[in-house]
Interface confidence: low
């Protein structure tokens, strides 16, 4: 029931750190595997409209009490459930409040109108760098640089789950100028807003900007990868960076296309298609196994763009850690 789940610390009741009630006690939810499908169910349960983001729970003040329990380590919803309680859940001991899940819903009761339905960074290398675009009524719009600040960039990066905003002088690629309507100018963010839509701005659609003034934002992409244990940077056991922690990748479904994407992303030429024996010479990793069942088409520029199971979900041991050997 709605009384068994709530969002805490947000600007309105439809955003914040996720808390659930068990046996009369409120506790947090760990963000292992937490994604937009889980948020969609939560928003539905709370009567908060559609999901709009999966921000980190630590963004919301006041933070969880140190003694407050993490009651659920991972939630796995298909997105069709009516309540979070209907989703697969695991309660385990090994989750800290640094990993509390957060949620942001559209909030149909909100005073601002209309409510844009999303934000993205377009035409960049990955989803954490690019031209700022916002979605409204199934149409993407660009944002004018007039009045834009690093504070506004912080909000975008947070909303996209892309870490901190990076100060950049980069302008939009002239060959990739927005051909869309210009949505907003005079964005006035404090930097603490959960979404760009929460920032005060000039009147919607009324501005004198042109696409030369489209806003470009770069965030500190939290995803990175490396090859360790080899003779050079282009060979070794594959490790990916997630939530500031390096972890390995399971070899289930791993093949030539996945090799090629890794080599491409690292600027290491082409895969040398190593044998099973060669792959095993770098030994097993330790710590987290972050990814499993990675599926690439081979066209991706980053492993992050390939399909995979939720972060941290796997049925592997470190004996199955992927290793990659590129031409260098």
């Amino acid at each position: 029931s709605p009384s068994g789940v709530r969002l805490v610390g947000g600007l309105h009741r439809c955003e914040g750190r996720v808390e659930v009630e068990q046996k009369g006690q409120w506790g947090t939810v760990c963000d292992d595997g937490w994604d937009i499908k889980d948020v969609a169910v939560l928003c539905r349960e709370l009567g908060c409209g559609a999901a709009s983001g999966t921000p980190s729970g630590i963004l919301y003040e006041p933070p969880a009490e140190k003694e407050q329990k993490v009651l659920i380590q991972s939630v796995s919803c298909t997105g069709t459930e009516d309540t979070l309680a209907q989703c697969e859940q695991e309660e385990v001991y090994d989750c800290s409040h640094d990993e509390d899940a957060g949620a942001s819903c559209e909030n149909p009761e909100s005073s601002f109108s209309p409510v844009p339905e999303g934000v993205r960074l377009a035409d960049g290398p990955g989803h954490c760098k690019g031209r700022v675009e916002v979605k409204h009524q199934n149409q993407w719009y660009t944002v004018c640089q007039t009045g834009w600040s690093l504070r506004a960039a912080k909000v975008v990066c947070r909303q996209l789950g892309c870490g901190r905003a990076v100060l950049t002088q980069k302008r939009c690629n002239k060959h990739a100028y927005g051909r869309k309507p210009i949505w907003l100018s005079q964005m006035s963010c404090s930097g603490r807003e959960a979404t760009l839509q929460d920032c005060p701005s000039g009147p919607w659609g009324k501005n004198t900007c042109n696409h030369d003034e489209d806003t470009w934002v770069e965030c500190e992409d939290p995803f990175d990868l490396r090859l360790v244990g080899g003779d050079n940077l282009c060979s070794g056991r594959l490790e990916v960076l997630h939530k500031g922690v390096w972890g390995s990748v399971c070899d289930d479904n791993w093949g030539e296309k996945e090799d090629q994407v890794v080599c491409k992303q690292l600027g290491c030429g082409k895969s040398l298609s190593p044998s099973f024996r060669d792959r095993k010479c770098y030994g097993p990793g330790v710590g987290r196994i972050w990814l499993d069942n990675v599926r690439c088409s081979g066209e991706e520029q980053s492993l992050e763009q390939c399909q995979h199971r939720f972060w941290g979900f796997h049925d592997c041991t470190h004996q199955e850690d992927v290793a990659v050997i590129c031409s260098g």
Partner: antibody, heavy 113, light 112 residues
Framework: QSVKESGGRLVTPGTPLTLTCTVS????????MTWVRQAPGKGLEYIGV?????NTYYATWATGRFTISKTSTTVDLKITSPTTEDTATYFC??????????WGQGTLVTISS | ELDLTQTPASVSAAVGGTVTINCQAS??????LTWYQQKPGQPPKLLIY???TLASGVPPRFKGSGSGTEFTLTISDLECDDAATYYC??????????????FGGGTEVEIK
């Protein structure tokens, strides 16, 4: 709720040895399990943990020397290449950040030629 | 890697007296500290968990306190049976400490 270790015996140096911890009354899907050892006359020494996901984490000194694995009701500790310094009583224990810590009685491993 | 520094290494006190043992963590472990008592030839006996919660059957003469990085075990009204070695252990797991459930070095308590 209980845990019980087994498999401790006398082996020669270099002979791999696997110890087993059998749990009852709780689930390894909701609890991690650790291995700890104590050499004769020495203090308690933490080896490593297997968490619910099956991920394993080892003390720095133990990495490469031990392997922890599990089934639905047992947790194994493999001593990959024992030396005489690995002679000790080995305990398995459920950590207790949210729940009450739970220990077994221990199993004695002797490494001698 | 997370370290627990336990002091003193040994202490001697009279029956009826009080002993205080300290345990310092190298990083924040919140309330995730456990205290054990061990006598020769026996497995460790749980005294205190979650820093201050008394385990079942343990007399209230044993008191745990602290949180974060500083913890204390106080044994008052000492009895002869309290002669043993006492250990603290971290029971807070996180990726930042690589799930290292480390022990302190132990404190040997002698009763005069």
């Amino acid at each position: 709720q209980s845990v019980k270790e087994s498999g401790g015996r006398l082996v020669t140096p270099g002979t791999p040895l696997t110890l087993t911890c059998t749990v009852s009354g709780f689930y390894l899907s909701t609890h991690g399990m650790t291995w700890v050892r104590q050499a004769p006359g020495k203090g308690l020494e933490y080896i490593g943990v297997i968490v619910t996901s099956g991920n394993t984490y080892y003390a720095t000194w133990a990495t490469g020397r031990f392997t922890i694995s599990k089934t639905s009701t047992t947790v194994d500790l493999k001593i990959t290449s024992p030396t005489t310094e690995d002679t000790a009583t080995y305990f398995c224990a459920r950590p207790g950040y949210k729940s009450v810590p739970l220990w077994g009685q221990g199993t004695l491993v002797t490494i001698s030629s | 890697e997370l370290d627990l520094t336990q002091t003193p290494a040994s202490v001697s006190a009279a029956v009826g007296g009080t002993v205080t043992i300290n345990c310092q963590a190298s990083e924040d472990i919140y309330s995730g500290l456990t205290w054990y008592q061990q006598k020769p030839g026996q497995p460790p006996k749980l005294l205190i968990y979650r820093a201050s919660t008394l385990a079942s059957g343990v007399p209230p003469r044993f008191k745990g306190s602290g949180s974060g990085t500083e913890f204390t075990l106080t044994i008052s009204d000492l009895e002869c049976d309290d002669a043993a070695t006492y250990y603290c252990q971290n029971n807070y797991g996180s990726s930042s400490n690589n799930y290292v459930f480390a022990f302190g070095g132990g404190t040997e308590v002698e009763i005069k």
